[in-house]
């Protein structure tokens, strides 16, 4: 978790002279109570936004937007904490807007926005905005939280990000498989413009069942540069076990941006269609 | 091929506890968290909680939280799933699934039946 | 706890036609809906979630819309094997929850 490296953060608005600081996620007010605190965040709602470095690259970002609550707790609301929390790994990011001056009831409800959150694809995550000071123990929270999650580098606009691009997003192997003769399967698919292997892993299933009856590992030596973008042919011999039938194949490219982590490329191929009754073989062909 | 294997039937008394495994193959075990659903005879999924499969750390539905405990075992790529004080009304299918948010592999369930 | 409700209970519907299932949340959750389809026996199978992105295998023919409150799952054409229940799932509120249930039957 980061923040976009982006020109100085702000938080102020007519109105409101405030200030972004990075951010310990244990706020003061967590060791010194106050005894008068502000109400909760109000319609907190987390979006996918996408944001460009000062580099120029393309960062998919957790666009965080919520209001106040019309109540007269904003003349002690002196801040905010935000909080961004990766769900699996329980990393946490916090920056905190600093109010340096006293909110007053206006004409309109006030509205924050905070958009420098850099987040990974087809991650999970959980947003958290504490209005300050934080309430005392046993006291209302004041707090709001909603989960987020990213779209993987198959989604039109991630597919562009920079991160996405790292990991062969770009790259449309347009996986054909097809079966042939004496138990073999031809798998054909198209080269990425970089001298890289590949590996292509096999593996089939029983019709109905997800646990396989066979496994295989091809490996593809890095192709020449004449050949990028051509398309390369493999038969794969499979092992002759009776309704050992549905065949899933995956390519796995070992690009240098991305190494053993790449993004995966998948067909499969299903059993052939049983017909439910078998239809008897007439013992006379009609002439009609 | 993503796979979530689960432990086999239990039968339980009235105030026993219940363990589940699910173990887990075909990704990194420790890229994605394990959420645990229960679902009782002829009734609607329940959501149980998760745990993160990194760090270990859990977050239980309210009316679970107490008498749950989830954990895991990275060197085996296995989640397990413990449930105490075992009820009547406990009697379940009791699903493990890959992820905390969006649950994109399910295991294949495992029933627990609670009766003295 | 966000409170999601499915109507209706039960849907019959003939092969061929289409079906449209209902998912209600007790507040706003964007775009944070998963759909999933469980036939007797098994375990559920993931459909459709957030940007209205269909899991890895799921067909055409089933398509989700709507965010905020009001959610919808289409299945423009059914298929025998598409008589199911399917169940909605918000994951916007830390605590999940799903919907009772949409059984989709044989008219």
């Known amino acids: 978790l980061r923040l976009l490296d982006h020109r100085a953060l702000v938080c102020s608005q007519p109105g409101l002279n405030c200030t972004v600081k990075n951010s310990t996620c244990l706020d003061d007010s967590w060791i010194h109570p106050r005894n008068l605190t502000p109400s909760s965040p109000k319609d907190l709602q987390i979006q996918l936004h996408f944001a460009h470095t000062q580099q120029g690259d393309l960062f998919p970002v957790a666009h965080i937007e919520w209001t106040l609550q019309t109540d007269a707790s904003i003349l002690y609301l002196e801040g905010a904490e935000l909080s961004v929390l990766q769900l699996n790994t329980n990393e946490r990011l916090c920056v905190r807007f600093e109010f340096l001056s006293k909110l007053r009831h206006h004409h309109r409800r006030w509205r924050f926005t905070f958009s420098h959150f850099v987040v990974d694809p087809d991650q999970e995550y959980e947003v958290t905005v504490h209005h300050l000071p934080k309430p005392i123990p046993d006291g209302d929270p004041n707090h709001q939280s909603k989960n987020f999650l990213v779209p993987d580098c198959e989604h039109a606009r991630m597919k562009v990000t920079t991160p996405c691009m790292s990991s062969g997003s770009l790259w449309d192997p347009n996986i054909t498989v097809e079966t042939l003769e004496a138990h073999q399967l031809r798998v054909s698919f198209t080269l990425w413009n970089e001298s890289t292997h590949y590996q292509i892993l096999l593996t089939s299933f029983p019709h109905m069942e997800n646990h396989s009856c066979f496994e295989h590992m091809h490996h593809i030596p890095a192709p020449r540069p004449e050949e990028f973008h051509q398309r390369s042919n493999v038969t794969l011999t499979l092992r002759n076990l009776k309704g050992c039938c549905r065949h899933q194949v995956q390519i796995q490219p070992f690009f240098s941006s991305c190494l053993n982590d790449c993004l995966r490329h998948s067909a499969t191929v299903s059993c052939p269609e049983m017909p439910d009754t078998p239809e008897p073989i007439p013992d006379y062909m009609p002439l009609w | 091929q993503v796979q979530l294997v689960q432990s086999g039937a239990e039968v339980k008394k009235p105030g026993a506890s219940v363990k589940v495994s699910c173990k887990a193959s075909?990704?990194?075990?420790?890229?994605?968290?394990i959420s645990w659903v229960r679902q009782a005879p002829g009734q609607g999924l329940e959501w149980m909680g998760w745990?993160?499969?990194?760090?270990?750390?859990?977050n239980y539905a309210k009316q679970f939280k107490g008498r749950v405990t989830m954990t895991t075992d990275t060197s085996t790529s296995t989640a397990y799933m413990e449930l105490r004080s075992l009820r009547s009304d406990d009697t379940a299918v009791y699903y493990c699934?890959?992820?905390?948010?969006?649950?994109?592999?399910w295991g294949q369930g495992t029933l627990v039946t609670v009766s003295s | 706890e966000i409170v999601m409700t499915q109507s209706p209970a039960t849907l019959s519907v003939s092969p061929g036609e289409r079906a449209t299932l209902s998912c209600r949340a007790s507040q706003d959750i964007s775009i944070s809906l998963g759909w999933f389809q469980q036939k007797p026996g098994q375990a559920p199978r993931p459909l459709i979630y957030?940007?209205?992105t269909r899991a890895t295998g799921v067909p055409a023919r089933f398509s989700g819309s709507g965010s905020g409150t009001d959610f919808t799952l289409t299945i423009s054409s059914l298929q025998s094997e598409d008589f199911a229940v399917y169940y909605c799932?918000?994951?916007?509120?830390?605590?999940?929850?799903f919907g009772g249930g949409t059984k989709v039957e044989i008219k």
């Open positions: 957030g940007w209205n």
């Open positions: 075909g990704y990194s075990f420790t890229r994605y968290g």
């Open positions: 745990i993160s499969t990194y760090s270990g750390n859990t």
């Open positions: 799932q918000q994951y916007s509120d830390p605590f999940l929850t």
């Open positions: 699934a890959r992820r905390v948010l969006r649950l994109d592999y």
